[in-house]
């Protein structure tokens, strides 16, 4: 099994590892499937691409019957199988079978924290946000290891790219020192940013 690892939105080339001459195409059926679902077929020269791969998949017949998937999505991750059937003695027989495992990475960048003063009060508001990752993120605010209550946390998903964005607000009393951590967990991964507030200088120091 061949393993291919790519970043989301990149291009992945999955090779069948087999060549068929133009002359042989009329007597050949090629099936690319992903986890038992069809991606692409070429039957005696007629090509058909399944709806979820249309307009973003190229079949490269000259390059080992490869499929090229453009603008990778997280849901493209999985095991692909290429089957080549050749016509011989009144039937199509399996001439070649190959498996390619595709991993699609979609890491959230380190979140950014911006702060705003709320006029005529001792309350200051900070906003933590990041976008462009997968799977669905879970954001929490921590201070001294204890979880805090955010004002509101919003998680949205782009229906086309399948990537998530997350944003959360936290209000705090600016008359005391604080060190807040914005922690985002997604799948088995995590990313965080720390915001420090120092009352003596009335300034903050985000960790980089």
């Amino acid at each position: 099994v061949i393993h291919v690892t790519k970043e989301v939105k990149e291009v992945a080339t999955l090779s069948c590892g087999h060549n068929v001459s133009v002359e042989e195409l009329a007597q050949t059926r090629i099936y690319w499937q992903k986890e038992k679902k069809m991606v692409l077929t070429m039957m005696s020269g007629d090509m058909n691409i399944w709806p979820e791969y249309k307009n973003r998949t190229i079949f490269d017949i000259t390059n080992n019957l490869s499929i090229v998937i453009l603008a990778l999505r997280p849901s493209d991750e999985g095991t692909y199988e290429c089957v080549v059937l050749k016509y011989e003695k009144d039937a199509f027989k399996r001439e070649h079978l190959a498996e390619v495992t595709l991993s699609v990475k979609a890491d959230f960048p380190t979140p950014s924290i911006s702060d705003f003063e709320i006029p005529t009060s001792n309350i200051r508001r900070i906003i933590c946000s990041t976008s462009g990752g997968f799977p669905e993120p879970h954001l929490s605010w921590l201070e001294n290891g204890e979880e805090l209550n955010a004002i509101n946390t919003t998680v949205s998903q782009d229906p086309e790219t399948e990537l998530y964005a997350v944003s959360s607000k936290l209000d705090f009393n600016m008359t005391t020192n604080h060190s807040f951590m914005c922690l985002i967990k997604y799948g088995h991964l995590r990313v965080n940013q720390t915001f420090n507030w120092n009352t003596t200088k009335q300034e903050h120091f985000p960790d980089n």
Partner: antibody
Framework: QLVQSGAEVKKPGASVKVSCKPS????????MHWVRQAPGQGLEWIGW????????LYDPKFQGKATITADTSTSTAYMELSSLRSEDTAVYYC?????????WGQGTLVTVSS | DIQMTQSPSSLSASVGDRVTITCSVS???????LHWYQQKPGKAPKPLIY???NLASGVPSRFSGSGSGTDYTLTISSLQPEDVATYYC?????????FGQGTKVEIK
């Protein structure tokens, strides 16, 4: 060349499993297809199975209704129909993959009646 | 899905007549992927012509096929009593595989 199981009469809501056993070849080496024909109607392709690895492909119209399986140890292909309704009354044929369907089973009549 | 439209849906002709059945395909396909079958009542379909114009094994030479792209034709040059049957075209260009609705041929 392809011998199918006998006619079945089933009640609505029941399931039925039709078998197809080739003589002279092993199904492991060929994709096996199923086609149906309702009384007085035309031919409708249901789907295929690659018996070697169990991969299947269905016409979306039959997804959830038909389940195609194969047992390579007995060289037999099966098609199970679930939640039967009167509209499922038809002759069901198995056929072997080729440039075209050169080999067909004799057909199995499935009658759904209360 | 590729739609297959046959015409006529039925016809009646005399023994010795030339009979033509047409099959219109909703999108262009390779001629290698167009096939014709003959089905007699109570029997499984039998291959007649494959790849537009090739006679299947044991098929009499009075049967012929032609066409390309989206338009295909099955011709019986001299209709015989044993040709009474329903004829179907079928595409193997893309899934799901589809058949025409059938043309019933009878003797006058």
């Amino acid at each position: 060349q392809l011998v199918q199981s006998g006619a079945e009469v089933k009640k609505p809501g029941a399931s039925v499993k039709v078998s197809c056993k080739p003589s002279g070849f092993n199904i492991k080496d060929y994709y096996m297809h199923w086609v149906r024909q309702a009384p007085g109607q035309g031919l409708e392709w249901i789907g295929w199975i690659d018996p070697e690895n169990g991969n299947t492909l269905y016409d979306p119209k039959f997804q959830g209704k038909a389940t195609i399986t194969a047992d390579t140890s007995t060289s037999t292909a099966y098609m199970e129909l679930s939640s039967l309704r009167s509209e499922d009354t038809a002759v069901y044929y198995c056929a072997r993959e080729g440039l075209f369907f050169a080999y067909w089973g004799q057909g199995t009549l499935v009658t759904v009646s209360s | 899905d590729i739609q297959m439209t046959q015409s006529p849906s039925s016809l009646s002709a005399s023994v010795g007549d030339r009979v033509t059945i047409t099959c219109s395909v909703s999108s262009s396909i390779s001629s290698s992927n167009l096939h014709w079958y003959q089905q007699k009542p109570g029997k499984a379909p039998k291959p007649l012509i494959y790849g537009t114009s090739n006679l299947a094994s044991g098929v009499p030479s009075r049967f012929s096929g032609s066409g390309s792209g989206t338009d295909y034709t099955l011709t019986i040059s001299s209709l015989q009593p044993e040709d009474v049957a329903t004829y179907y075209c079928q595409q193997w260009s893309s899934y799901p595989l589809t058949f025409g609705q059938g043309t019933k041929v009878e003797i006058k």
